[in-house]
Interface confidence: medium
């Protein structure tokens, strides 16, 4: 009869390497008498005999993990006990080996230049995979801006345009290599103005081209603003090359303005804009005798529309920054004040003021205003508006009407050309062509070029002294 013998583990457990989903077996060979009871633990926790993931055979000496999972990693021990002596134990590690697997692959990214981009690449594998990145067809080199994090993610600080491209991450260990799909890194660039429009100081009627060049990704759109509003006139030409948009605004300059170039592009739901402004000013016309101090154009205002001849070309004085607006403002101010004058004076004064402020242009190719004939000026002064004119003279020779902003010049009759000398050198006010005693009504007021016939009007000399500077506003 055999003598009792305490258990001896003749084959200690060894470290077992196993691939996921494969079988892993620990062998615990025991010699003893009587036959021992063998139990198994994993990480000090007893493996239950009825756990279907395990198979325990050969009287408990063989433990088989039927389909290894990543979580099966750990220390496995067999404990043998037959009641003779103490229990004996042998332990070994299960190292779950895993080909690299990319658990969180990178995705397409749109990022604004200058920001930080992170392309994820989370991996699994045993041994732990090393992660590298490929850009296009080449291995990506790390530098002060570009780093592969411990997690495997690619971090790019201060993203530049040249960082744009196709990327993939590569996870590699001794068991194999895994590649992510190609992803695209798109670098968006805030709209930026490369070339701002230049300010110009030009003469009235010049053509000016304002040029604005902008860059951005996506390519920006360029819009132009004139004095805070969309540009109402001028032609815009645009071209795009290498993500640079070149916009040229051609203007026909009739008034000064602030022109703003606005470059805009979209980043997701947000927009980025860049602005640059240029002024177009109208040069002071030099006082040399070659410079006409204005230009001739059709009257486009409202105040004198019924007074001036239809389609007449009138003279606009470029000593004003914006002649047409300035002259219209002057006449508008005066017009309101004329409400106070007598019904006899008012239409005559309106005709005089309109034809004086908007003098007819003499025919020809160089702009020259044609003043009112002296005789018609005197008719208004001494006949139609005698009472008002005297009252005006009494107000310190500064004019009946003041707005504080402008002083409207009333013509000094004595300085106007006489139609007796040259009927073609001045403008007449035809509705005044009546004898004094016949003036009871006022026909529609239009001005015209004088003809040779001389109206029955006051003599060219004034019956009282004319002050050197009359003005109305």
């Amino acid at each position: 009869e055999k003598l009792p013998k305490a258990p001896v583990i003749t084959t200690p457990l060894e470290t077992v390497d196993a691939l996921v989903e494969e079988v892993a077996t620990f062998m615990c060979a025991v010699e003893s008498y009587p036959q021992p009871e063998i139990s198994w633990t994993r990480n000090k926790i007893l493996i239950k005999l009825f756990d279907t993931r395990y198979s325990i055979r050969e009287n408990g000496q063989l433990l088989t993990i039927l389909s290894v999972e990543d979580s099966d990693d750990g220390i496995y021990c067999c404990i043998a006990n037959n009641g003779v002596g103490g229990a004996v134990e042998s332990c070994g590690a299960l190292q779950v080996k895993m080909k690299p697997k990319i658990t969180r692959p990178p995705i397409n990214v749109k990022i604004i230049e200058g920001l930080k981009a992170v392309l994820p690449c989370t991996t699994m594998g045993n041994p732990k995979p090393s992660v590298s990145w490929i850009k296009g067809d080449n291995a990506l080199r790390e530098n002060s801006r570009i780093a592969v994090l411990e997690s495997g993610s690619l971090r790019i600080h201060n993203v530049q345009k040249e960082d744009a491209g196709q990327y993939r991450c590569v996870a590699k260990n001794s068991l194999g290599t895994a590649y992510s799909k190609l992803v695209k890194l798109e670098v968006e660039v805030f709209a930026r103005i490369l070339r701002a429009p230049e300010s110009h100081n030009v003469t009235f009627g010049s053509f000016v081209t304002l040029r604005c060049t902008a860059i951005g990704i996506p390519v920006p759109t360029i819009s132009w603003i004139e004095n805070g509003n969309a540009v109402s006139s001028g032609s815009i030409q645009e071209s795009v090359k290498d993500r640079v948009i070149d916009s040229r605004l051609q203007l026909f300059i009739t008034k000064p303005g602030l022109y703003t170039c606005i470059a805009t592009n979209k980043h997701g739901e947000k927009f980025s804009t860049a602005k640059a402004a240029a002024t177009v000013s109208i040069a002071e016309w030099s006082k040399s005798q070659k410079d006409s101090q204005g230009y001739c154009a059709q009257y486009r205002g409202e105040v004198c529309d019924a007074v001036l001849a239809k389609d007449a070309l009138v003279f606009f004085n470029t000593s004003y920054r914006d002649p047409e607006d300035a002259q219209e403002l002057l006449i508008h101010t005066a017009w309101n004040e004329l409400k106070a004058v007598s019904p006899l004076c008012r239409p005559a004064a309106e005709a005089l003021l309109c034809n004086h402020l908007f003098q007819e242009c003499s025919p020809g190719v160089v702009p020259t205003p044609m003043p009112i004939c002296r005789e018609y000026c005197l008719a208004v002064k001494e006949l139609f508006c005698a009472k008002e004119w005297q009252a005006m003279e009494g107000k310190a020779h500064r004019g009946l009407y003041r707005s504080g902003m402008h002083l409207l010049p009333v013509p000094e009759c004595s300085k106007l050309p006489s139609m007796h000398r040259d009927p073609t050198a001045c403008t007449r006010l035809p509705y005044l062509d009546y004898k004094k005693e016949n003036i009871t009504t006022f026909p529609s007021i239009t001005s015209s070029r004088p003809s040779a016939d001389i109206p029955n009007l006051p003599a060219s000399t004034s019956s009282f002294a004319v002050s050197p500077a009359y003005s109305m506003t």
Partner: antibody, heavy 120, light 108 residues
């Protein structure tokens, strides 16, 4: 970029009326002055007249009795009619922008010109 | 009728300076404008208001005015500058436009 293009018959009989049209492209005819200028073969330039977009015209005094310039803003065109032509009116006829009343007293740009021959 | 007088021809070697004059009684009062015309082509504005140069015109083109004479100066003349040059101005009353008879510039 404003461009001008003259069109019309290249041959006109003496005593008849020469008619040419200038089409403006790349910009509006409005707000500008538009001129006709001619150049007899081998000779210098002669200004014929201008028209403002509103229809206001002014002509070279030496040609005034025979010249009519008109404008069609809807078509962006202006036209020249020169009546009672003689062989002396044989020339290259140019249309150009400018030439009037202080708003661009110079001529720029020009059309490429069209040769009109007066001959029976 | 009013006239502007130009020399019929001016010759100059490449790199030299060419000066073309234009005389007229009204030139102290009226601006002059200069045009370049090459054979078979329309004239091109090279100087306006006596001395202003349009954009796109080389800096070698300049203009000046003195009394009844205006002058177009082309410094460092190039072969491509060979052309006819015309001055334009108005009569003294500004009634109509007049062109000079033209000057043929020959680059030797």
């Amino acid at each position: 970029q404003v461009q001008l293009q003259e069109s019309g018959p290249g041959l006109v009989k003496p005593s008849e009326t020469l008619s040419l049209t200038c089409t403006v492209s790349g910009g509006s005819i409005s707000s500008y002055y538009w001129s006709w200028i001619r150049q007899p073969p081998g000779k210098g330039l002669e200004w014929i007249g201008y028209i403002y977009f509103s229809g206001r015209t002014y002509y070279n005094p030496s040609l005034k009795s025979r010249v009519t310039i008109s404008v069609d803003t809807s078509k962006n065109q202006f036209s020249l009619k020169l009546s009672s032509v003689t062989a002396a009116d044989t020339a290259v006829y140019y249309c150009a922008r400018g030439g009037g009343l202080g708003i661009s007293n110079w001529f720029d740009p020009w059309g490429q010109g069209t040769l009109v021959t007066v001959s029976s | 009728s009013y006239e502007l007088t130009q020399p019929p021809s001016v010759s100059v070697s490449p790199g030299q300076t060419a000066r073309i004059t234009c005389s007229g009684d009204a030139l102290p009062k009226q601006y002059a404008y200069w045009y370049q015309q090459k054979p078979g082509q329309a004239p091109v504005l090279v100087i306006y208001k006596d001395s202003e140069r349009p954009s796109g015109i080389p800096e070698r083109f300049s203009g000046s005015s003195s009394g009844t004479t205006v002058t177009l100066t082309i410094s460092g003349v190039q072969a491509e500058d060979e052309a006819d040059y015309y001055c334009q101005s108005a009569d003294s009353s500004g009634t109509y436009w007049v062109f000079g008879g033209g000057t043929k510039l020959t680059v030797l």
